[in-house]
């Protein structure tokens, strides 16, 4: 009668959609020569095999090209390789060794394959820092994908200027040359597994290093509304004795170091304020002249100046000779 043998290992295996799994099978060591034949993997209850090495046997359309019998009698190997796993593959399987010449064959115990939703997501790796104007290679990788599966399709989405680099079964390279305006924007890598019809994605926010592009000064005079200057100003009239608050603001990433100087500073000048705020509690003759805000950044510096012109109060200055 039909001879039976036990599959070694677990009674069920789990695989995620789109991925691969190996159903282990070892032929009995005491296999009589005349019983040696072709190998067939069957879905429980089906007559047509899902995989076989019999050249005259058809396999199920649904599993053709995805299910493979790994046949190596020297190592007693009769394992089933499943790639591009689909939800419909969720079933019990068994192996049968059979020669059409013989009445009986060898039939294995059953093993259940459970196909779960894909939970893995692509990884996006960035080498070092993204610098404005400098090309960088970003890699989207799916290291959990098996080599023998249908290669996934990689799609990139970004507002930044990009070009596609090399790809492998498990990764895709994107060359990005970011601009300052690309800082904090989204970049998405989408991976589709055509064999199983599953798509996964990962989105990151770009952290782009760039030198200051704009520097501005906001001026607060007493209780009056602030106004902003965006370029070097030759003369700003200010009433003597008035309190003045100068607020310097610059872009750049990481944030630029802001400092205030009186006059037009040399590179190694000492600032009068090491922050972006310069408080002038009572404007007098000492404050007349130029004030410069410098935005310092590893990738470049920018500065803006304004010239204060002090209006004297009518009773203001003590008379001269």
């Amino acid at each position: 009668q039909e001879r039976r043998f036990q599959l070694e290992g677990p009674e069920s295996l789990t695989v995620q959609e789109g991925l691969c799994v190996l159903v282990p099978c070892r032929l009995p060591t005491t296999l009589p020569a005349s019983y040696y034949g072709y190998g067939y993997w069957f879905l429980e209850g089906a007559d047509v095999p899902v995989a076989t090495n019999d050249p005259d046997e058809e396999v199920q359309e649904e599993t053709r090209g995805r299910f493979h019998l790994l046949w190596d009698p020297r190592r007693k190997n009769c394992s089933l390789s499943i790639r591009d796993a689909r939800r419909r593959d969720n079933a019990a399987y068994f192996f049968r060794l059979k020669s059409k010449w013989m009445k009986y064959g060898y039939t294995s115990s059953k093993l259940s394959v459970r196909v779960m939703a894909l939970t893995h997501r692509p990884n996006i790796s960035i080498p070092g820092t993204l610098e404005s104007g400098h090309p960088s290679n970003l890699t989207c990788s799916v290291p959990w994908v098996c080599e023998q599966g249908t290669p996934p399709i990689f799609s990139w989405m970004s507002a930044a200027p990009t070009s596609l680099g090399p790809r492998t079964t498990q990764s895709s390279v994107l060359t990005i040359t970011p601009r300052p305006q690309d800082h904090s924007t989204n970049l998405t890598c989408q991976v589709t597994f055509p064999g199983a019809g599953v798509t996964m994605e990962r989105t990151i926010q770009l952290n782009v290093s760039y030198a200051p592009q704009k520097v501005a000064i906001s001026i607060f005079q007493g209780n009056s509304a602030a106004f902003k200057i965006l370029q070097n100003t030759s003369s700003l009239p200010v009433l003597e004795g008035q309190a003045l608050r100068l607020l310097c603001d610059a872009d750049g990433n990481p944030p630029a170091h802001l400092s205030w100087f009186q006059g037009f500073p040399a590179l190694n000048a000492t600032p009068i304020s090491n922050t972006g705020v310069l408080e002038l509690p009572q404007v007098g003759s000492a404050e007349e002249g130029d004030f410069t805000c410098r935005a310092q950044h590893p990738l470049g510096s920018l500065q803006i100046s304004l010239s204060l012109f002090v209006h004297w109060k009518p009773e203001g200055r003590a008379g001269g000779v």
């Epitope: 009589p32 005349s34 040696y36 005259d56 009698p73 020297r74 020669s99 059409k100 013989m102």
Partner: antibody, heavy 116, light 107 residues
Framework: KVQLLESGGGLVQPGRSLRLSCAAS????????MHWVRQAPGKGLEWVSG????????GYADSVKGRFTISRDNSKNTLYLQMNSLRAEDTAVYYC?????????WGQGTMVTVSS | DIQMTQSPSSLSASVGDRVTITCRAS??????LNWYQQKPGKAPKLLIY???SLQSGVPSRFSGSGSGTDFTLTISSLQPEDFATYYC?????????FGPGTKVDIK
């Protein structure tokens, strides 16, 4: 003890017919495929024909196709080879053999000589 | 049909020698290859099946290897009773075909 005993060989004229028989013993005959293999004098082995356990699958070498017919009677534990339109090149020792895709047991053979 | 070739067609060797016989198929036959030994006036005897599986009762000095189209039968240390003719046979598809044989005789 597993045994295969061929009979029916002999001298026959070209164009005539001959029927070989193979009596099997020592194993469950209808579990196994059976084959005929021949060997011309001083030559190598040539697979002639094979038949599955239930006669559902049958195969022939091109050199005998259309002239030879393999059959079996499981109730009698016997394998047959009906040889028609015999030719001089069919002269050989005919072995009955047991097996699926691997022939593991051979009979001692019966000599068929086709000559005028 | 699948053609089988063997080399050498004959070889002379001494007791204790390591002997290697090769067999080639005209197309891939996976591991569906058997080796038989035949002595004059006797029926063939199965030595190796499935390219590398040793038939029960056959001495371990006989070994087989290969898959696809190229196969080898090795006798690690030739014994007096090993002088015979060796045949390979493919059982991948009908018609099953034998190689022409390799005769191993005494040097």
């Amino acid at each position: 003890k597993v045994q295969l005993l061929e009979s029916g060989g002999g001298l026959v004229q070209p164009g005539r017919s001959l029927r070989l028989s193979c009596a099997a013993s020592g194993f469950t005959f209808d579990d196994y495929g059976m084959h005929w293999v021949r060997q011309a004098p001083g030559k190598g082995l040539e697979w002639v024909s094979g038949i599955s356990w239930n006669s559902g699958s049958i195969g022939y070498a091109d050199s005998v196709k259309g002239r030879f017919t393999i059959s079996r009677d499981n109730s009698k534990n016997t394998l047959y080879l009906q040889m028609n339109s015999l030719r001089a090149e069919d002269t050989a020792v005919y072995y009955c053999a047991r097996g699926g895709q691997t022939i593991d047991i051979w009979g001692q053979g019966t000599m068929v000589t086709v000559s005028s | 049909d699948i053609q089988m070739t063997q080399s050498p067609s004959s070889l002379s060797a001494s007791v204790g020698d390591r002997v290697t016989i090769t067999c080639r198929a005209s197309q891939s036959i996976s591991s569906y290859l058997n080796w038989y030994q035949q002595k004059p006036g006797k029926a063939p005897k199965l030595l190796i099946y499935a390219a590398s599986s040793l038939q029960s009762g056959v001495p371990s000095r006989f070994s087989g290897s290969g898959s696809g189209t190229d196969f080898t039968l090795t006798i690690s240390s030739l014994q007096p009773e090993d002088f015979a003719t060796y045949y390979c046979q493919q059982s991948y598809s009908t018609p099953f075909t034998f190689g022409p044989g390799t005769k191993v005789d005494i040097k």
